[in-house]
């Protein structure tokens, strides 16, 4: 549910939201680290209704959710949570 992508594209997010999304309505989360043409970290959330929203990385709820997902992934190996795609 949590993915990290390294991409050569510039910033994907034009607008960011801090609005809370319950976990049951999240399909997956994509993290784009800063660099490679974009000066900021970006978080893209796919909702269960197929819509996509960019989430403010400073939003407290997304930070908490990612921490929970990281902890869960480390305790449920070998299922990978972070997928790294190098262009």
């Amino acid at each position: 549910v949590l993915e990290v992508y390294y991409t050569s594209l510039r910033c994907r997010c034009v607008q960011e939201s801090s609005v809370f999304i319950p976990r049951r309505f999240i399909d997956r989360i994509q993290i784009l680290p800063r660099g490679n043409g974009c000066p900021r970290k970006e978080i893209i959330v796919w909702k269960k209704n197929k819509s996509i929203v960019c989430v403010d990385p400073q939003a407290e709820w997304i930070q908490r959710m990612m921490e929970v997902l990281r902890k869960r992934s480390s305790s449920t190996l070998p299922v990978p949570v972070f997928k790294r795609k190098i262009p």
Epitope: V19, F20, P22, K47, N49, E60, R64
Partner: antibody, heavy 119, light 107 residues
Framework: EVQLQQSGPELVKPGASVKISCQAS????????MNWVKQSHGKRLEWIGD????????TYNQKFKDKATLTVDKSSSTAYMDLRSLTSEDSAVYYC????????????WGQGTSVTVSS | DIVMTQSHKFMSTSVGDRVSITCKAS??????VAWYQQKPGQSPKVLIY???HRHTGVPDRFTASGSGTDFTFTISSVQAEDLAVYYC?????????FGGGTKLEIK
């Protein structure tokens, strides 16, 4: 304009069942979860559960899983709630309410259906 | 289940006053909290979502804050039409749960 039109008041006997309807208009019915909420005379609101009209998937509050059954009829954009084995504890106003995909609270509510259980 | 506690069942205030209603969650709900207004004889209406975001068309005298377990809903200058019951609701985890409601009475 989004509207949720609920069926009229019900007076039923203990042990009986009742089916409440909620007809939606003004939006794509299949695209939004429909919630059901109970409001007893003590005024507290209780979430019964929700249904995804797109795939008929339901999530119930465990408290109501043996009491309520949620269904939809996509052809008429109508959500239904069946309540069974009714007792005086089930006397309440029942609301249908649409879940917002923008902010995940309930953004549109029906006018409520009053159910009175009495012999 | 997550219990949402509104400590005051009734609050009495005067037109023009500032009033704050509190809501406490029994466990961390992040910012997954909404506030609803229910006027006499009407259905509930969402005012605030995601703990602090005002819904479209809601007057700016209504504000809210909080995160984790403690939440506050404020009316900066109460109007006569604000006579209603106000409910908090968590939508962090199912079953979604509501506070017991706070009835705002106008003196």
């Amino acid at each position: 304009e989004v509207q949720l039109q609920q069926s009229g008041p019900e007076l039923v006997k203990p042990g009986a069942s009742v089916k409440i309807s909620c007809q939606a208009s003004g939006y794509a019915f299949s695209d939004y979860y429909m919630n059901w909420v109970k409001q007893s005379h003590g005024k507290r609101l209780e979430w019964i559960g929700d249904i995804n009209p797109n795939n008929d998937g339901t999530t119930y509050n465990q408290k109501f899983k043996d009491k309520a059954t949620l269904t939809v009829d996509k052809s008429s954009s109508t959500a239904y709630m069946d309540l069974r084995s009714l007792t005086s504890e089930d006397s309440a106003v029942y609301y249908c309410a649409r879940l917002s995909w923008s902010f995940f609270a309930m953004d549109y509510w029906g006018q409520g259906t009053s159910v009175t259980v009495s012999s | 289940d997550i219990v949402m506690t509104q400590s005051h069942k009734f609050m009495s205030t005067s037109v023009g006053d500032r009033v704050s209603i509190t809501c406490k969650a029994s466990q961390d709900v992040s910012s997954g909290v909404a506030w609803y207004q229910q006027k006499p004889g009407q259905s509930p209406k969402v005012l605030i979502y995601s703990a602090s975001h005002r819904h479209t068309g809601v007057p700016d005298r209504f504000t809210a804050s909080g995160s984790g377990t403690d939440f506050t809903f404020t009316i900066s200058s109460v109007q006569a039409e604000d006579l209603a019951v106000y409910y908090c609701q968590q939508y962090y985890n199912t079953p979604w749960t509501f506070g017991g409601g706070t009835k705002l009475e106008i003196k």
